[in-house]
Every structure is written in structure tokens, then in C-alpha cells.
């Protein structure tokens, strides 16, 4: 988890002098509770936005937006703590909006935004906005949270971001798999424009089951430049096991930008349809 560029982060707006600060996620008001605390944020909204770094890279960011409730506690609001927790790693990053002037009610509802938390493809985050100071131990909570899922690199808008392109999102192998005679599969796919090797991982399963009955790995050496964007055809021999008929073919590239952690593409061949067994024809016809 990180912030997009450390260019000047702004939270000031007409009628409010405000500064954005790094935070330890442990605000002082936890340790030294205050008697009067503000109410919670209203209408927390999170969207996926895209932002360029100063180097020109494009990253997905969480755009966080919330409004203030129109009650008197606005007079005791000193700022806000924004927290993003990545659920699979338990990594947390916080920033603090510090209000340098007192808020006053004005003709429209106060609204705040922040769009600098860089998020990763296919990850889930808990996004929390905590008004400061935080409540006393038994006080009403004054935060709002949402669990936010970021689309993976298959998403059209995500595909062109720097992290997705680095993992090979622009490569479309257009895999085709056909069953040949004599227990063989022909796998065909389009090579990318990089001289790097590939691996084909074949996993076979029985008709309705999910434990594999056959596994095979096939190495494809790095293509020459004249072979870039050409089709590569590979014939794989299957184990002759009755009922081991559903085949998943996965192609793993080893691009220089992602090495052994590149996006994999797969295709599945289903078991052939079993024809309905016809009713047996009796040897004689009953006469009734």
C-alpha cells in the first residue's frame, strides 16, 4: 500500500484551511479522549479512479468521498483519519486531514475527497473514514467503513494500467484446444512480442469431479523475433484413462516485467456428451 506520488496533497477548500499529513493510524484522541466529539461521516462513497504518476505511469487509485452531517458537532470536528486496510496482507495505510481553521455551517453541505491511495488489481480493501477526535471509549462510533473490491486485470479499464501491463495484461493468446485421435490434444496460442519462454500446464479431471486424474507440464522455448505474434502449436499426449476426459490447459508466460508471476490464461475442454442409452428392443413383441 502506498500513496500516489508525494506531490502536495490538498484538502483545503473555500472556508476551510486544511493540511494532509501522514498518520500512524493511532490518533492522539485514542490515548487522550475528549469530552466533545463530532458525529460520523455521512454517505461514504468509494470509486475506482485512475491517475498518472509524474513519470507517466497509470495506476488504479481509490477515490474516497464523504460529506458531513448537518449537526452542531461540526464545531468540534478537528479533522479526519482515512485508513485503507488490504485484507489479504493486513497492511494498513493512513493519512490525516488536519483542519487548521474552525468549520462553520454554510449554504451547502461540506464534502471531502481523497484520491491518492494506490490499490492493486484483484484485491479487497477496507476503507474507513474516522472523524477526529475519535469518541470516548463508550461513545457512539464516528466512523464509516466499506469493503472495496478492485477489479482484476481482465477488466477493460484495468488492463491498460501499469501494474496490469507489467504482468502481461495486453497479451491475448487466443488459446484453442482440440481433441485428436489416439489420446492427444492440440494446443494452439498466439506468442507475445518478447523473446521469453512459456509453459503449458495440463490438468485433466474426471467428468463431474474436481480432483485431477492427470497432470503434465510442457516447456516452450523462447521464440525468435520473426515468430512474435505467430501461432504456436503443441501436441500433448494424454494418459489413456477412461473417464479422465475434462482437460484444463493453462499457459504461463515468463515475460521480463513479471518473470514467474505473470497473468496466466487458460482454456477448458469438456468431456464429450454421452449419448442417451437407447431402450433395449425386446426379442419378441407381446401380443396384448
Amino acid at each position: 500500500l502506498r500513496l500516489l506520488d508525494h506531490r502536495a496533497l490538498v484538502c483545503s477548500q473555500p472556508g476551510l484551511n486544511c493540511t494532509v499529513k501522514n498518520s500512524t493510524c493511532l490518533d492522539d484522541s485514542w490515548i487522550h479522549p475528549r469530552n466533545l466529539t463530532p458525529s460520523s461521516p455521512k454517505d461514504l462513497q468509494i470509486q475506482l479512479h485512475f491517475a498518472h504518476t509524474q513519470q507517466g505511469d497509470l495506476f488504479p487509485v481509490a477515490h474516497i468521498e464523504w460529506t458531513l452531517q448537518t449537526d452542531a458537532s461540526i464545531l468540534y470536528l478537528e479533522g479526519a483519519e482515512l485508513s485503507v486496510l488490504q485484507l489479504n496482507t493486513n497492511e494498513r495505510l493512513c493519512v490525516r486531514f488536519e483542519f487548521l481553521s474552525k468549520l462553520r455551517h454554510h449554504h451547502r453541505r461540506w464534502r471531502f475527497t481523497f484520491s491518492h491511495f494506490v490499490v492493486d488489481p484483484d484485491q479487497e480493501y477496507e476503507v474507513t473514514v474516522h472523524h477526529l477526535p475519535k469518541p470516548i471509549p463508550d461513545g457512539d462510533p464516528n466512523h464509516q467503513s466499506k469493503n472495496f473490491l478492485v477489479p482484476d486485470c481482465e477488466h477493460a479499464r484495468m488492463k491498460v494500467t501499469t501494474p496490469c501491463m507489467s504482468s502481461g495484461s495486453l497479451w491475448d493468446p487466443n488459446i484453442t484446444v482440440e481433441t485428436l485421435e489416439a489420446h492427444q490434444l492440440r494446443v494452439s496460442f498466439t506468442l507475445w512480442n518478447e523473446s521469453t519462454h512459456y509453459q503449458i500446464l495440463l490438468t485433466s479431471f474426471p467428468h463431474m469431479e474436481n480432483h485431477s486424474c492427470f497432470e503434465h507440464m510442457h516447456h516452450i522455448p523462447a521464440p525468435r523475433p520473426e515468430e512474435f505474434h505467430q501461432r504456436s502449436n503443441v501436441t500433448l499426449t494424454l494418459r489413456n484413462l477412461k473417464g479422465c476426459c475434462r482437460h484444463q490447459v493453462q499457459i504461463q508466460p515468463f515475460f521480463s516485467s513479471c518473470l514467474n508471476d505473470c497473468l496466466r490464461h487458460s482454456a477448458t475442454v469438456s468431456c464429450p456428451e454421452m449419448p442417451d442409452t437407447p431402450e433395449p428392443i425386446p426379442d419378441y413383441m407381446p401380443l396384448w
Epitope: 462513497q45 470509486q47 469493503n147 472495496f148 478492485v150 477489479p151 477488466h155
Partner: nanobody, 126 residues
Framework: QVQLVESGGGLVQPGRSLRLSCAAS????????MHWVRQAPGKGLEWVSG????????DYADSVKGRFTISRDNAKNSLYLQMNSLRAEDTAVYYC???????????????????WGQGTLVTVSS
């Protein structure tokens, strides 16, 4: 322009099933999370279910969990709600709605729902 058109509502007996459909047009359907929201007679709006852009994540209101199933077919720009074991309290106008922003939030919409269909009435009565 964005259009969401619901269909499949009607009168059904308690315990029976119904499948609602929503045909979407005018935007890139597979970029956005989609939701079903309902409004019972004389009541406010109630979020029913949501589904992520690719159908990989789905969430339901407690009142329908285990009975309703949301799904989508991005190739057909369509959203569905399979409603089983219907109860009288499921009687409502059901709306299909699009999330304003990209991304998906558990248990509701991430941001406001910016486009809604005209709704389809589901009446559960014996």
C-alpha cells in the same frame, strides 16, 4: 443514452419462484457493478442484491439471503434475479440499477446508483 429495462414481474403464490431480467444498453455493461433494489408498497427503497463487474462477487440483503440469486451475462448485457421461496413480504416494485463508479463494495453500492430502470412489480399472494 443509458437504458435499463426490467421484465419478469407478476403475480405469484407464496413459496413459488420468479426470475427477473434487466436488459442494459447505452454504457459498457461489463465495466460496472449492478444492483437490484426494491420498494414495497408505502415503504422506502431497500437494497436487495449486488454483483461485481464480472459476476465474481455477489452480496444479498439478510432478508433474501439463501432464497434469491443474482447473476449477469455480460455477453448479453443482462442482469438477472432468481427469486425462490417467495413470501408475501417480497411484494414490491423491483428496480435494476447501475453503480456510478468502477469497483465493487460488499453489502451495498460503493457510490450512488446513477441509473435505474422503470421497475417491475412482483406481487406474492395466494
Amino acid at each position: 443514452q443509458v437504458q435499463l429495462v426490467e421484465s419478469g414481474g407478476g403475480l405469484v403464490q407464496p413459496g413459488r419462484s420468479l426470475r427477473l431480467s434487466c436488459a442494459a444498453s447505452g454504457f459498457t455493461f461489463d465495466d460496472y457493478a449492478m444492483h437490484w433494489v426494491r420498494q414495497a408498497p408505502g415503504k422506502g427503497l431497500e437494497w436487495v442484491s449486488g454483483i461485481s463487474w464480472n459476476g465474481g462477487s455477489m452480496d444479498y440483503a439478510d432478508s433474501v439471503k439463501g432464497r434469491f440469486t443474482i447473476s449477469r451475462d455480460n455477453a448479453k448485457n443482462s442482469l438477472y434475479l432468481q427469486m425462490n421461496s417467495l413470501r408475501a413480504e417480497d411484494t414490491a416494485v423491483y428496480y435494476c440499477a447501475k453503480d456510478r463508479g468502477l469497483g465493487y463494495c460488499r453489502g451495498g453500492s460503493c457510490s450512488s446508483l446513477d441509473y435505474w430502470g422503470q421497475g417491475t412489480l412482483v406481487t406474492v399472494s395466494s
